[in-house]
């Protein structure tokens, strides 16, 4: 089965690479996950995304869990997911009406 992910291998400043031009087809039977790396810097939030094998992504996210402190300067969070384009934009919260 082939999965599609958003991919920007180099960090993008304040651009979460979630527009159509960043969509790629991952390698069949090898890259079965989408990965997202979010780094918080003084200049803003940096995003890096790619396809990944489940082993590689899980090794990375587990090994670097201690570096993830959302909202804190120099925090780096790595997440893995396995549905199409799941490393895209976070769904916007609906305002209560």
């Amino acid at each position: 089965l082939q999965i599609q992910c958003y991919q920007c291998e180099e960090f993008q400043l304040n651009n979460d690479c979630s527009s159509p031009e960043f969509i790629v087809n991952c390698t069949v039977n090898v890259q079965d996950m989408c990965q997202k790396e979010v780094m918080e810097q003084s200049a803003g939030i940096m995003y890096r995304k790619s396809c990944a094998s489940s082993a590689a992504c899980l090794i990375a996210s587990a090994g670097y869990q201690s570096f993830c402190s959302p909202g804190k300067l120099n925090s780096v969070c790595i997440s893995c997911c396995n549905t199409p384009l799941c490393n895209g934009p976070r769904p916007k919260k609906r305002g209560s009406s």
Partner: antibody, heavy 120, light 107 residues
Framework: EVQLVESGGGLVQPGGSLRLSCAAS????????IHWVRQAPGKGLEWVGR????????YYADSVKGRFTISADTSKNTAYLQMNSLRAEDTAVYYC?????????????WGQGTLVTVSS | DIQMTQSPSSLSASVGDRVTITCRAS??????VAWYQQKPGKAPKLLIY???FLYSGVPSRFSGSGSGTDFTLTISSLQPEDFATYYC?????????FGQGTKVEIK
């Protein structure tokens, strides 16, 4: 035990070609980036390029772009550096190293290096 | 490309001395900096990753600090086996540039 072993170095004439191998054991290369780094005699470390073996995605230093090609054979757990149009300034010890493909990760295991000499 | 500039390029010190090597990035690299030790004829060895984390098996006399653009490697009490060349390297984006190296020699 994690190990990287380079081979294929030697003496080659300017304009010639050489293929270096980096055989990995103790880990699966598909879970890591494999980097090539070189060191000219008496000089510092210079990054050459890298491959993410699971996708085949490669990046190269400007100094070797268009002349060097990095590839990997995941069934052999081995990465390669194909060097074409070699120049005298490519003379160096070539190392392969592994790096988890996340920002904060570093090159934690290195091979012993293989010497490439480009001379007529 | 982001440049990494090390200083000094060489230094002379005695066993027991405290040694400090600095590395400056030309742009913010957060904490994505590593330090390596290399002895003549040998491959580099990882000492510090992510600016301040001691790699497994590395003696605690080595420490790293810094974030953004300024980074420091400190050897609290220099030992005979520490005479070597030290390199900083940024792991943030491609290319993962190395500093030019600092040679630590015996005084």
């Amino acid at each position: 035990e994690v190990q990287l072993v380079e081979s294929g170095g030697g003496l080659v004439q300017p304009g010639g070609s050489l293929r270096l191998s980096c055989a990995a054991s103790g880990f699966t290369i598909t879970n890591y980036g494999i980097h090539w780094v070189r060191q000219a005699p008496g000089k510092g470390l210079e990054w050459v390029g890298r491959i993410y073996p699971d996708s085949g995605a490669t990046y190269y230093a400007d100094s070797v772009k268009g002349r060097f090609t990095i590839s990997a054979d995941t069934s052999k757990n081995t990465a390669y550096l194909q060097m074409n149009s070699l120049r005298a300034e490519d003379t160096a010890v070539y190392y392969c190293a592994r790096k988890l493909w996340v920002t904060l990760a570093s090159m934690d295991y290195w091979g012993q290096g293989t010497l490439v000499t480009v001379s007529s | 490309d982001i440049q990494m500039t090390q200083s000094p390029s060489s230094l002379s010190a005695s066993v027991g001395d405290r040694v400090t090597i600095t590395c400056r990035a030309s742009q913010d690299v957060s904490t994505a900096v590593a330090w390596y030790q290399q002895k003549p004829g040998k491959a580099p060895k990882l000492l510090i990753y992510s600016a301040s984390f001691l790699y497994s098996g590395v003696p605690s006399r080595f420490s790293g600090s810094g974030s953004g653009t300024d980074f420091t490697l400190t050897i609290s009490s220099l030992q005979p086996e520490d005479f070597a060349t030290y390199y900083c390297q940024k792991s943030y984006n491609t290319p993962p540039t190395f500093g030019q190296g600092t040679k630590v020699e015996i005084k």
